[in-house]
């Protein structure tokens, strides 16, 4: 009382930091700093982030909240998790689509667009790896189909004459009836 020396940050508990004259307790996640504390080891005046803004971490200095990102509809993105006061919108791809990064060194914050997953069934192939972070990995042809060029061709139902070697190996059993 009545002194002129600003106190050191030797406040009880953690999360105090010098803001101007005094050591202040910071604001919790989801809140921004309206005004610093007015006395040693005091609480800063913190307000909840307005709608469509957020702050993910406790902080001493943010006087405004960050704007929530909007998912890029042009890139076929959808919101997997809506923005809250403590977390940004999490954008991703809807089921049946996968993330295609727009940069070579891909990290979580990299720009991306969504691509439809390959439908292995429509290609008459086994699904080897389901589509999620990358495109579907299709395997060998389904039963009743054989490899021909890049695709799977349906086994013939008539004579073996029109059935090449690979076809015969896969489809030969059909001709026993």
């Amino acid at each position: 009382q009545g002194g002129t020396r600003s106190p050191r940050c030797d406040c009880a508990g953690d999360f105090h930091k010098k803001i101007g004259l005094f050591c202040c307790r910071g604001c919790p996640a989801g809140h921004y700093l309206k005004a610093p504390c007015t006395e040693p080891c005091g609480n800063s005046t913190c307000l909840v982030c307005p709608q469509d803004t957020f702050l993910a971490w406790e902080n001493h200095h943010n006087s405004e909240c960050a704007r929530c990102q909007a998912c890029d509809e042009q890139a076929s993105q959808v919101a997997l998790e809506n923005c809250s006061a403590v977390a940004d919108t999490r954008c991703g791809c809807k089921p049946g689509w996968f993330v295609e990064c727009q940069v070579s060194q891909c990290v979580s914050s990299s720009p991306f667009y969504c691509q439809p997953c390959l439908d292995c069934g429509a290609l008459h192939r086994h699904t080897r790896l389901l589509c999620s972070r990358r495109d579907t990995d299709c395997g060998t042809c389904l039963p009743g189909f054989y490899e021909h060029g890049d695709g799977c061709v349906s086994c013939p139902t008539s004579t073996l004459g029109s059935c090449p070697e690979r076809c015969a190996a896969v489809c030969g059993w059909r001709q026993m009836f």
């Epitope: 002194g3 020396r5 007015t38």
Partner: antibody
């Protein structure tokens, strides 16, 4: 609109006393630290005292310690400066200012003249 | 106490000129520095806080920079209404202290 209006200034003889008031409006007074800053005629600005938002912490410049007392009444949105044993060198315009360090709003000032 | 040394104490410049005022603290004050404008017979007005943060409503021709002990205040293009005395002020430590002021005049 934030407003700070000082009153209580005037002429006083050396050794006399005055009580300055600062009426605050347009903001939540009880959330802010407040200061008194003075300016002698033709001179620069001198911070003299600070009080925390609750009134629980007060600080003074060495030049006025033991002579001036800062106080506040949050119910009345008012800040005060009790000035005793006034000397000629206390002649100045006295401003109340809002903030805990950086002063974003100031009153218009009240002139205190100490002269025999 | 932290001593704030402002220079120059006065300066004369023409409309449109770039004007620079410096402020030096006697010890490290981080970025806890404000700049004020005071016109004759009026209360000071806060222009810049935290060394470089322009207050709402203050024209963008005013700017501040610096950290530690050396700070600069700049008016990029002097206007007639900028004629005033300018003060720096530290709030890193009590007692709060001001520079002695810089009186700005038009040539």
């Amino acid at each position: 609109e934030v407003q700070l209006v000082e009153s209580g200034g005037g002429s006083v003889q050396p050794g006399g006393s005055l009580r300055l008031s600062c009426a605050a409006s347009g903001f939540t007074f009880s959330s802010y630290g407040m200061s008194w800053v003075r300016q002698a005629p033709g001179k620069g600005l001198e911070w003299i005292s600070y009080i925390s938002s609750s009134g629980g912490h007060t600080y003074y410049a060495d030049s006025v310690k033991g002579q001036f007392t800062i106080s506040r009444d949050n119910a009345k949105n008012s800040l005060y400066l009790q000035m005793n044993s006034l000397r000629a060198e206390d002649t100045a315009v006295y401003y109340c200012a809002r903030g805990s360090g950086s002063f974003d709003y100031w009153g218009q000032g009240t002139l205190v003249t100490v002269s025999s | 106490d932290i001593v704030m040394t402002q220079s120059p104490s006065s300066l004369s410049a023409s409309v449109g000129d770039r004007v620079t005022i410096t402020c030096q603290a006697s010890q490290d004050i981080s970025n806890y520095l404000s700049w004020y404008q005071q016109k004759p017979g009026k209360a000071p007005k806060l222009l810049i806080s935290d060394a470089s943060n322009l207050e709402t409503g203050v024209p963008s021709r005013f700017s501040g920079s610096g950290s530690g002990t050396d700070f600069t205040f700049t008016i990029s293009s002097l206007q007639p209404e900028d004629i005033a005395t300018y003060y720096c002020q530290q709030y890193d430590n009590l007692p709060i202290t001001f520079g002695q002021g810089t009186r700005l005049e038009i040539k």
